[in-house]
Amino acid sequence: IVLRPSRVHNSEENTMRALTLKDILNGTFSYKTFFPNWISGQEYLHQSADNNIVLYNIETGQSYTILSNRTMKSVNASNYGLSPDRQFVYLESDYSKLWRYSYTATYYIYDLSNGEFVRGNELPRPIQYLCWSPVGSKLAYVYQNNIYLKQRPGDPPFQITFNGRENKIFNGIPDWVYEEEMLATKYALWWSPNGKFLAYAEFNDTDIPVIAYSYYGDEQYPRTINIPYPKAGAKNPVVRIFIIDTTYPAYVGPQEVPVPAMIASSDYYFSWLTWVTDERVCLQWLKRVQNVSVLSICDFREDWQTWDCPKTQEHIEESRTGWAGGFFVSTPVFSYDAISYYKIFSDKDGYKHIHYIKDTVENAIQITSGKWEAINIFRVTQDSLFYSSNEFEEYPGRRNIYRISIGSYPPSKKCVTCHLRKERCQYYTASFSDYAKYYALVCYGPGIPISTLHDGRTDQEIKILEENKELENALKNIQLPKEEIKKLEVDEITLWYKMILPPQFDRSKKYPLLIQVYGGPCSQSVRSVFAVNWISYLASKEGMVIALVDGRGTAFQGDKLLYAVYRKLGVYEVEDQITAVRKFIEMGFIDEKRIAIWGWSYGGYVSSLALASGTGLFKCGIAVAPVSSWEYYASVYTERFMGLPTKDDNLEHYKNSTVMARAEYFRNVDYLLIHGTADDNVHFQNSAQIAKALVNAQVDFQAMWYSDQNHGLSGLSTNHLYTHMTHFLKQCFSLSD
């Protein structure tokens, strides 16, 4: 099936041009999405093109500027946040990135009622995290690893924690590993629904080994960056959860929430916190061996001013075939009775589905079922549950939004998005206003993305929020590649693939093939989304065929495929890429002497192993920031899939699955190894060890490092990287420059 047909007709051919690398590097064909910043059931904020913050009321159709661009500009604000009582706005400036989600910034508070900035008791700088309470205008913020509270923006702060210390104790913010591999946020504090309580995590990294690397900068001597970073098997952070009454914070101080006994008996993680009411909270915990998760519902005891987590309110989720959950353990969405909840986990057939838990997990009522997966629960109201899945037409790489009426019996299911713009839109996400009165749908493709506003009761489209008209016009004279998503059936395994074909693709001709791989556990590369990127250019201008294949270990096709790689990373992911390549050769239009593979991060690991597989299939390949040994990567991620690197656990496979162990096999391929020297995530150590092994084996290879660049290789490095990789591939495929 052709998802994005090229609009080439002979009469037009001379007016149309191929994509250039410059187009890609300049972001000429990037698209826009529109996510309303909801502030009520029928109102949202949006930053206009001229940088005013505008409040829109859907019901009255009126809009007005709540904050002038003059005010934004006066502090060079790049972000804002309105207090729920609408009296204040925080303005964020001096953004300074730290890790994937974390950054520090300077915050200014603007008083909307008085039309001026708040002076007196100003916030310190730089702040690590700041947020409003859900009601009113209390402020919680983290400064120098400690948490502070303000009852009003102009009030003096109340210091909640005192033990915060750089790289040692983190309060209200995660350490490196919790940020990247567990919480996926820059914060670790949570307001209760009405702002009565503030829950927060404390991470103690005192005993964690430190990764140290040079940051060269411009000085005479490089700086050393030190990060407490637990690699597989190393000592982990110690986590504690506290809750403080924000109305009378000094009265009893922070109260620790007890850890379930079955969790506390050995190393464990805290995985998420969900407030249910102001006096009920739900915590999720995970054993270090990540196949057992416990959801614990705790209640505030007024008499003792403590939090009680009865065993009867502990719900265990266990996997016998792999790890608990998908990438993360799913979080509960509570219903209006404040005790029962909806949650996605594996059903008896091994597909992730929505379940309704009223008393015990064993008695859970399955809400969705089938040989597809429920992916996200967006919202539960009194009468509806909105979720996304890949059920429609059995394409795992699609996302549609569904509504289940839970108010009626039996519950009825309706696909909200399946037939809206069927050719253009097959991959959606949604953003809901309070009580799901209205919602925005954001369609990512396969056609040009479009964002629309809908009535939450009738699902009627109200208006288009963003349709990317400029992009559509800009693409009119571009020869885009053709894209098709199909599947291969091999030995009872379904391998979905996306093939990107040159605009004038002719099945009777032979084309060079580039495999783009990620392949990490619970990932998905074959998605029905729009993109004009580097591989689009390679197909459009350089005449390559590019293929992406979702093999074993990838997500949303059931546990059999997902958990196939459990404790065996680096085996089946590689096998499945090789199998797919052989199938592509059989199709007759691939020049089998010109096949390459490339990947980044986990994809760099897989591409390296594929190149070193000894099959002779690949002429060349590129690994960008690859993992080279699982002993070098983060404990939380690695151990989830590999267990521990100990003799009595899985040390043998840790050793067998390294890239270095296969150094000899790189002799007959052209290998380009690339890494940033300041990669905090996949440390440069990984590539340094590959290079050392190749040198020791006397194997020739090419390499490029990017000084002071992290895992993203951003800025000017991006341009250099893609230019360099393009030259490498063109040389490999004997394409003229």
Epitope: R86, S113, G115
Partner: antibody, heavy 124, light 113 residues
């Protein structure tokens, strides 16, 4: 010349409410916040609260919170101050005044023009 | 709340003489970011609303005679009438607009001796 014209004097019984208006003219209404200040006999000036006409968001002195409501009608360039549960100590002259909105971080403005005042007498 | 205290409560000065009124705030009105003091002086004549004389502690409002001047910073401020005229008989108030609630001094009554 900028003008802030207030409604006339009122006599109210304890427990009642009073609503005073302040009609502005000859300036851009949305460039200034409107504030209400009162002056009881022989007392210092006392700030009651203010409002931003751009968004209708009020800010009240905690002392009056729950008893005072400040509103604006932008189309009429008029501000209102309603004080409820009146008591004898609320007898005062009530003034409205304008204050320029500070868009910039380093700005800050005083109340440059005032209404003529409205005498509110609370007596049984 | 910031408390504003004026001294003296009343002041009798001969025509053509200097009148000096002091105002003290319970916390600093100096804003470090722009080195400005958020203090204003008002004049109120009987039966009239207050009239703005000085803002930012020392900047004269347009149309205000230059015999009126303001000085001071932080917590201590002064309004000076260099040569008192008959029309200057009034009550003078200082006011802080550094933070909310806005607060006024108790007023200083200036009379002719």
């Amino acid at each position: 010349q900028v003008q802030l014209v207030q409604s006339g004097a009122e006599v109210k019984k304890p427990g009642a409410s009073v609503k005073v208006s302040c009609k502005t003219s000859r300036y851009t209404f949305t460039e200034y916040t409107i504030h209400w200040v009162r002056q009881a006999p022989g007392q210092r000036l006392e700030w009651i609260g203010g409002i931003n006409p751009n968004n209708g968001i009020p800010n009240y002195n905690q002392k009056f919170k729950g008893r005072v409501t400040i509103t604006v009608d932008t189309s009429a360039s008029t501000a209102y101050m309603e004080l409820s549960s009146l008591r004898s100590e609320d007898t005062a002259v009530y003034y409205c005044a304008r204050r320029r909105i500070a868009y910039g971080y380093d700005e800050g403005h005083a109340m440059d023009y005032w209404g003529q005042g409205t005498l509110v007498t609370v007596s049984s | 709340d910031i408390v504003m205290t004026q001294s003296p409560d009343s002041l009798a000065v001969s025509l053509g003489e200097r009148a000096t009124i002091n105002c003290k705030s319970s916390q600093s009105l100096l804003y470090s970011r722009n080195q400005q003091n958020y203090l204003a002086w008002y004049q109120q004549k009987p039966g009239q609303p207050p009239k703005l004389l000085i803002f930012w502690a020392s900047t004269r409002e347009s149309g205000v005679p230059d015999r009126f001047s303001g000085s001071g910073f932080g917590t201590d401020f002064t309004l000076t009438i260099s040569s008192l005229q008959a029309e200057d008989v009034a009550v003078y108030y200082c006011q802080q607009y550094f933070s909310y609630p806005l607060t006024f001094g108790q007023g200083t009554k200036v009379e002719i001796k």
